[in-house]
């Protein structure tokens, strides 16, 4: 049975031009974690896999950082990367965790973050 | 320039283990995995897995579990992957790759090792 | 595991002829797709990943789309040294998993 339950970072906002930390937290079950894929709508961003590191795709290598830990720092934020983001948690024995993620890309200068993950 | 340069062809007996080696250069050895591919006579292309020169992580196709050891010597860039216990249908050619930067599809290929399991 | 089913598993065309092949993912794999040559004897070499980039050296004629679970890879314009054995890969989850390969022959 899934036991476990994904955090993530909720709605968050960030400024055209900054960056923002794309953060997930799978609690509440013993399973292991085998790797954590990152995805936009409709294309891969990243996999951290446990044993075989980092894979990121040829779009975002540019502009994506691995980490911090499991999470995805994305920078040189455009209007274009407003949408929706997942974390897939691959486990065993648990199978697939999923967190969404609603980022919106600001022109302005005030951006409020999420609650759960604070951004410095 | 990179290149995966493997050992020679192997004729083992059922039973036996084979070990197959990679020596690697023209780049930093640690800073890319190696992964390995076989292919049996008129066959297509199977995953064993994968490791990670420079934890020494490695990552298995269940298939081959408990059958496969993926380990690295830094010192001298080689990457090496021995199968036990083996089996006829173990006889194929055994492919060192490696991967793209911060890639896992696989960029570069050794030439392969013939392994003929036969008794 | 993932099944990636590919076709044709064979297909004869001319010179000069738009080839397409396909994959199919038994389940979503996103844009984690890789596609190989293989020519007989030889070791395979990476074409086209994620699923759309053309590798290093890689001709225009060759190409690659797709996203979720379909996948296309296409040769524009046959050339008779494109003869060759086509594979797709996935790398969405391991274990990785390859295609049954395309035989790419030439009228």
């Known amino acids: 049975m899934m036991t476990g339950t994904i955090e993530t970072t909720g709605n968050i906002s960030a400024e055209k031009g900054g960056s923002i930390i794309l953060q997930c937290h799978l609690s509440s079950t013993t399973a292991q974690v085998t790797q954590v894929n990152w995805e936009q709508q409709d294309q891969l961003l990243a996999i951290c896999n446990a044993d075989l590191g980092w894979h990121i795709s040829p779009s975002f290598k540019d502009r994506v950082a691995p980490g911090p830990g499991l999470g995805l720092t994305l920078q040189s934020l455009t209007v274009n990367d407003t949408g929706e983001y997942f974390c897939i948690y691959h486990t065993y024995p648990d199978g697939t965790y999923t967190g969404r993620i609603f980022l919106e890309v600001l022109e302005s200068s005030v951006a409020e973050h999420g609650a759960r993950f604070q951004i410095p | 320039q990179v290149q995966l340069v493997q050992s020679g062809a192997e004729v083992k007996k059922p039973g036996a283990s084979v070990k197959v080696s990679c020596k690697a250069s023209g780049y930093t050895f640690i800073s890319y995995n190696i992964y390995w591919v076989r292919q049996a006579p008129g066959q297509g292309l199977e995953w064993m897995g994968g490791v990670n020169p420079s934890n020494g992580n490695t990552n298995f196709n269940e298939n081959f579990q408990g059958r496969v050891t993926m380990t690295v010597d830094t010192s001298i860039s080689t990457a090496y992957m021995e199968l036990s216990r083996l089996r006829s249908d173990d006889t194929a050619v055994y492919y060192c790759?490696?991967?793209?930067?911060?890639?896992?599809?696989?960029?570069?290929w050794g030439q392969g090792t013939t392994v003929t399991v036969s008794s | 595991d993932i099944q990636m089913t590919q076709s044709p598993s064979s297909l004869s065309a001319s010179v000069g002829d738009r080839v397409t092949i396909t994959c199919k993912a038994s389940q979503h794999v996103s844009t984690a797709v890789a596609w190989y040559q293989q020519k007989p004897g030889k070791a395979p070499k990476l074409l086209i990943y994620s699923p759309s980039y053309r590798y290093t050296g890689v001709p225009s004629r060759f190409s690659g789309s797709g996203s979720g679970t379909d996948f296309t890879f296409t040769i524009s314009s046959l050339q008779p040294e494109d003869i060759a054995t086509y594979y797709c890969?996935?790398?969405?989850?391991?274990?990785?998993?390859f295609g049954g390969g395309t035989k790419l022959e030439i009228k």
């Open positions: 790759t490696r991967g793209n930067y911060y890639g896992y599809e696989f960029a570069y």
């Open positions: 890969q996935q790398h969405y989850s391991t274990p990785w998993t």
